[in-house]
Interface confidence: low
C-alpha cells in the first residue's frame, strides 16, 4: 500500500480581515493511526493552531467529523481573521506512540494572506497658522491596511495635488501596513473656504475611496488691509475719520486709534461683516475734535490682527484748514498717509 | 516627534507623585502612549498605557496604583502614582506607541526615587 | 504572560566584528518583536520591529531575523557608536508588553 500523503491543495488563501478562512488538508490514506494538527511556521518556532487529539482552540471548527472512523479530510475554518493571522500554515499527521505521538508526515504548506481595510485617513495641518502665497505641508495618515498595495491622492477643493511625498511601512514583509504621506500646498486669499482632501484607494475599498479632510480655515491667517478716509463734517469743529479694515481672517482683531502717537481708543473686532470668500471686514470711526488741536494731527488706525504684529495706517488731519473745506479729501488726497509695522 | 516627561523626585514611601508628558510633532490623539520604567542599573519595565482612543492598561504590579490619563487638549499624558513602594524607583520614561504596540518615541525620561 | 530571554548577558567584542544577540520568547509571538538601543544616560531608540523592519533612519548594518519564538538581532560591522545596551520587546501582546533583560555590548 503507498505510502500515505498529506495534501494541502491550496498553495495559497486570501481572506478579508473578520471573515472566516477555510485551510483545506486531506490525507491519501488512514494508515498510520495518529491525530493530525495545525501548525502556523515551521521548524522549531512553529506555533500550533489545531490539536485534533487535546487542546482549547474556540476560533478554530474542522470541516468533516474527525471522530468518524474512515474519515481523511483535515480542513480547517478559522473565525475572526484579523492580519496577525497572516502566515504560512501546515497541515501535520502524527504516528500515535508511547508516551507522545510522533511527527510523520506534513503537507506543503499554505500562505494565509489577509486583506484588512484601511483605517480611516487622518489629515493634519501645521500648527501654527500661515499668510497666503506660503507653503503648508498636511500630512495624511492611514494604518492596519494588506496587502502594501495601496493608492493615495491629495485634493484641494477637487483639484487634485502633484507635490507630496508617501512611504509605507514597513518595507519588507509585514502582516499589515502603515502610510503616511505629507502634501505641501500653497495658500491663496481665496483659501478660507478650501478643503485639503487626502484620499486613499485600496483593493478592499472596492472602488470606494476612503477620504479624510481638513479645512484651511483652520490654517490660513489672511492679513488685513486698511484704508483711512475722512468723512464730511459731522459738526462744527468736529471731524469723523473711519478706518476700513477689509478681508480679513481669523476674526480676532484689535484696534487702535493714535492720535498724534498718543493713544485714543482701543477696541475688539465685534460686529464684522463676512465676505462671500469667507474673509472678514469691518469698521472703526473717530470723532475727533479740532479745536482741541493747535497744530496739524497725525491720526494713525493701528491693527493688531490674530497676535501678529501690528500694521497700521496715518491721516494727517489738518487743523489749520477749516473743517468743512477738509470734508471732501480721501485717503488717496492725504500724500502723508502710509502703511508701517508697529514692533 | 518630541516626548518632555516632568514631575519626577523624591518622596516618602506610600507618598503619590504625578508624573506628566508633554507631546509635540504628532496628532497626539490619534496615538498610543505608555510609560515605561528603569529602575537603576535594571531593564526596561512596561509599566502602563493609554489608547488613542482612551483605553486603559497596566502591568500587574501597578494595578490599583496607577492611574494612567490623557488630556488631548494639552497634547498631555499623566500618570497619578499612589502608595509609593522603594521598588517603584526608576526612571520613567514616556513613550509613543505605534499602532502595532511598539515605541518609537521615548522622552528622556524622569526620575522618581522612593526612599525615607 | 510572554518572557523574553536575551543571550548571552554581555559580549565582549571588537570595532568592525559581527555581533547576533538573541531574544527567546516563551511562546509563539507571530514575529512581532521589536529591538531597542540604549546608551548610557539616554533613552531607549527603536531599532527594528515585525522582527526584521528597520526604523526610520536606523544603517543598514542593523538587521532582524527569526520567527515563532527565537528572534536574532545583527550587527554586520560594529562601530564605535553601537556600543550599548539591546533591549527585545514584544508587541504581540498587551497584557502584559514585556522586555527581554538586555544584552550589553562592550568594547573588548
Known amino acids: 500500500e503507498e505510502e500515505l500523503q498529506v495534501i494541502q491543495p491550496d498553495k495559497s488563501v486570501l481572506v478579508a480581515a473578520g471573515e472566516t478562512a477555510t485551510l483545506r488538508c486531506t490525507a491519501t490514506s488512514l494508515i498510520p493511526v495518529g491525530p493530525i494538527q495545525w501548525f502556523r511556521g515551521a521548524g522549531p518556532g512553529r506555533e500550533l493552531i489545531y490539536n485534533q487529539k487535546e487542546g482549547h482552540f474556540p476560533r478554530v471548527t474542522t470541516v468533516s467529523d474527525l471522530t468518524k472512523r474512515n474519515n481523511m479530510d483535515f480542513s480547517i475554518r478559522i473565525g475572526n481573521i484579523t492580519p496577525a493571522d497572516a502566515g504560512t500554515y501546515y497541515c501535520v499527521k502524527f504516528r500515535k506512540g508511547s508516551p507522545d505521538d510522533v511527527e510523520f508526515k506534513s503537507g506543503a504548506g499554505t500562505e494565509l494572506s489577509v486583506r484588512a481595510k484601511p483605517s480611516a485617513p487622518v489629515v493634519s495641518g501645521p500648527a501654527a497658522r500661515a499668510t497666503p502665497q506660503h507653503t503648508v505641508s498636511f500630512t495624511c495618515e492611514s494604518h492596519g491596511f494588506s496587502p502594501r498595495d495601496i493608492t493615495l491622492k491629495w485634493f484641494k477643493n477637487g483639484n487634485e495635488l502633484s507635490d507630496f511625498q508617501t512611504n509605507v511601512d514597513p518595507v519588507g514583509e509585514s502582516v499589515s501596513y502603515s502610510i503616511h504621506s505629507t502634501a505641501k500646498v500653497v495658500l491663496t486669499r481665496e483659501d478660507v473656504h478650501s478643503q485639503v482632501i487626502c484620499e486613499v484607494a485600496h483593493v478592499t475599498l472596492q472602488g470606494d475611496p476612503l477620504r479624510g479632510t481638513a479645512n484651511l480655515s483652520e490654517t490660513i491667517r489672511v492679513p488685513p488691509t486698511l484704508e483711512v478716509t475722512q468723512q464730511p463734517v459731522r459738526a462744527e469743529n468736529q471731524v469723523n475719520v473711519t478706518c476700513q479694515v477689509r478681508k480679513f481672517y481669523p476674526q480676532r482683531l484689535q484696534l487702535t486709534w493714535l492720535e498724534n502717537g498718543n493713544v485714543s481708543r482701543t477696541e475688539t473686532a465685534s460686529t464684522v461683516t463676512e465676505n462671500k470668500d469667507g474673509t472678514y471686514n469691518w469698521m472703526s470711526w473717530l470723532l475727533v475734535n479740532v479745536s482741541a488741536h493747535r497744530d496739524d494731527v497725525k491720526l494713525t488706525c493701528q491693527v493688531e490682527h490674530d497676535g501678529q504684529p501690528a500694521v497700521s495706517k496715518s491721516h494727517d488731519l489738518k487743523v489749520s484748514a477749516h473743517p468743512k473745506e477738509q470734508g471732501s479729501n480721501t485717503a488717496a488726497e492725504n500724500t502723508g498717509s502710509n502703511e508701517r509695522n508697529i514692533y | 516627534v518630541q516626548l518632555v516627561e516632568s514631575g519626577g523626585g523624591l518622596v516618602q514611601p506610600g507618598g503619590s507623585l504625578r508624573l506628566s508628558c508633554t507631546a509635540s510633532?504628532?496628532?497626539?490623539?490619534?496615538?498610543?502612549m505608555s510609560w515605561v520604567r528603569q529602575a537603576p542599573g535594571e531593564g526596561l519595565e512596561w509599566v502602563s498605557a493609554s489608547s488613542g482612543s482612551g483605553s486603559t492598561y497596566y502591568t500587574d504590579s501597578v494595578k490599583g496604583r496607577f492611574t494612567i490619563s490623557r488630556d488631548n487638549s494639552k497634547n498631555t499624558l499623566y500618570l497619578q502614582m499612589n502608595s509609593l513602594r522603594a521598588e517603584d524607583t526608576a526612571i520613567y520614561y514616556c513613550?509613543?506607541?505605534?499602532?502595532?504596540?511598539?515605541?518609537?518615541?521615548w522622552g528622556l525620561g524622569t526620575l522618581v526615587t522612593v526612599s525615607s | 504572560e510572554i518572557v523574553l530571554t536575551q543571550s548571552p548577558g554581555t559580549l565582549s567584542v571588537s570595532p568592525g566584528e559581527r555581533v547576533t544577540l538573541t531574544c527567546r520568547a516563551s511562546?509563539?509571538?507571530?514575529?512581532?518583536i521589536a529591538w531597542y538601543q540604549q546608551k548610557p544616560g539616554q533613552a531607549p531608540r527603536l531599532l527594528i520591529y515585525?522582527?526584521?523592519s528597520r526604523a526610520t533612519g536606523i544603517p543598514g548594518r542593523f538587521s532582524g531575523s527569526g520567527s515563532g519564538t527565537e528572534f536574532t538581532l545583527t550587527i554586520t560591522s560594529l562601530q564605535s557608536e553601537d556600543f550599548a545596551v539591546y533591549y527585545c520587546?514584544?508587541?504581540?501582546?498587551?497584557?502584559?508588553?514585556?522586555f527581554g533583560g538586555g544584552t550589553k555590548v562592550e568594547i573588548k
Open positions: 513613550a509613543k506607541v505605534t499602532w502595532n504596540n511598539f515605541f518609537d518615541y
Open positions: 520587546q514584544q508587541h504581540y501582546d498587551w497584557s502584559p508588553l514585556t
Open positions: 510633532g504628532f496628532t497626539f490623539r490619534n496615538y498610543g
Open positions: 511562546q509563539g509571538i507571530a514575529g512581532k
Open positions: 515585525d522582527a526584521s
